[in-house]
């Protein structure tokens, strides 16, 4: 699996999307888990409604919400009030029995709240971008780009 990078600003909300084949994963509940250590287990953060037909209902665990568009094939995770320690490697999973298929590996990067308190709209965001295959990516603690500072484009 490639790793997809999502960036957000500390204190704000971040939405992560995980597309999937709706037919292949028909009837399956979904989950969002956090990788602990490079080779450690993926610890469940939140999962969709126990009744698959109600997967569209948003479920919260603390500041993390999950909702599933089972027809469109998009799992959406919302991280509210993003914090530096939320940065890290996560997975979107499709559950079947005691097994879990990885839908997408996600790296959440947290940008520090801009020092000059500009709107997040003034920041440079790549949105989401694919990283290299089989990537294990460090969680990203970062600041906004300073005036006149030009980032290089994301690699893909």
């Amino acid at each position: 699996h490639n790793t997809t990078v999502f960036q957000g600003v500390a204190g704000q909300s971040l939405q992560v999307s995980c597309p999937y084949d709706s037919m292949k994963h028909w009837g399956r509940r979904k989950a969002w888990c956090r990788q602990l250590g490079e080779k450690g287990p993926c610890q469940r953060v939140v999962s969709t409604h126990n009744l698959w037909l109600l997967s569209f209902l948003r479920r919260w665990n603390g500041s993390t919400a999950i909702t599933d568009d089972t027809l469109g094939g998009t799992l959406t995770i919302t991280l509210r009030n993003l914090q530096p320690h939320d940065a890290g490697l996560y997975q979107c999973q499709s559950l079947h029995g005691s097994e879990a298929d990885t839908l997408r590996k996600v790296l959440v990067e947290v940008l520090a709240d801009p020092l000059d308190h500009r709107d997040a709209g003034d920041l440079w965001f790549p949105g989401e971008s694919e990283s290299f295959e089989d990537a294990h990516v460090e969680h990203s603690i970062s600041r906004s780009l300073l005036e006149g500072e030009i980032p290089f484009p994301p690699t893909s």
Partner: antibody, heavy 120, light 107 residues
Framework: QVQLVQSGAEVKKPGASVKVSCKAS????????ISWVRQAPGQGLEWMGW????????NYAQKLQGRVTMTTDTSTSTAYMELRSLRSDDTAVYYC?????????????WGQGTLVTVSS | DIQMTQSPSSLSASVGDRVTITCRAS??????LNWYQQKPGKAPKLLIY???SLQSGVPSRFSGSGSGTDFTLTISSLQPEDFATYYC?????????FGGGTKVEIK
């Protein structure tokens, strides 16, 4: 295996700048961020900042803001740390480190360190 | 900034001793705490991450515990190669901060 090889020792005069390099090998460079940590002689560890090798975003320690710049060259899998307006208290061993990918900012691969001496 | 206070700053112990080092954060950092070992002239080495998870390849005599503000690194039976300086480090919030270090010396 993973290796982070840093540039050699430097002696600089106060007010000058220094640029330390950290060449990575043994893994996909753009898949792990690089942090910089320094250690003054006989002192503890001080986090200087971090750079995302994915897109160049950085986070710097407040006390170094304006004096430090971290960059990467993905074509050579090399990270750089430049420190300007050097003072005698910048004399330290500077380390680069690769992150764990765990969401807990722990570093298990480190460069060998680069001694920067600031002296008139 | 979150202040990390380590104690003791140094200690003398013998091979085979049980050694305990404590680290206190100035505010709750949940389990976002790591422990490093550093020997003179060498780069630090990760021992424990996420307060209690043993890094791969690190001997099982090292263990970590704690959550919130109080954390402990324990060496169950000190070995000759364990004489070094140990640092705790928080990654809960910007900026990342370290404890002042604990030097473990031979008695």
């Amino acid at each position: 295996q993973v290796q982070l090889v840093q540039s050699g020792a430097e002696v600089k005069k106060p007010g000058a700048s220094v640029k330390v390099s950290c060449k990575a090998s043994g893994y996909t460079f753009t898949s792990y961020g690089i942090s910089w940590v320094r250690q003054a002689p006989g002192q503890g560890l001080e986090w200087m900042g971090w750079i995302s090798t994915y897109n160049g975003n950085t986070n710097y320690a407040q006390k170094l803001q304006g004096r430090v710049t971290m960059t990467t060259d993905t074509s050579t899998s090399t990270a750089y740390m430049e420190l300007r307006s050097l003072r005698s208290d910048d004399t330290a061993v500077y380390y680069c480190a690769r992150g764990s990918g765990s969401g807990y900012d722990s570093w298990y691969d480190w460069g060998q360190g680069t001694l920067v001496t600031v002296s008139s | 900034d979150i202040q990390m206070t380590q104690s003791p700053s140094s200690l003398s112990a013998s091979v085979g001793d049980r050694v305990t080092i404590t680290c206190r954060a100035s505010q709750s950092i949940s389990s976002y705490l790591n422990w490093y070992q550093q020997k003179p002239g060498k780069a630090p080495k990760l021992l424990i991450y996420a307060a209690s998870s043993l890094q791969s390849g690190v001997p099982s005599r090292f263990s970590g515990s704690g959550s919130g503000t109080d954390f402990t690194l324990t060496i169950s039976s000190l070995q000759p190669e364990d004489f070094a300086t140990y640092y705790c480090q928080q990654s809960y919030d910007f900026p990342i901060t370290f404890g002042g270090g604990t030097k473990v010396e031979i008695k």
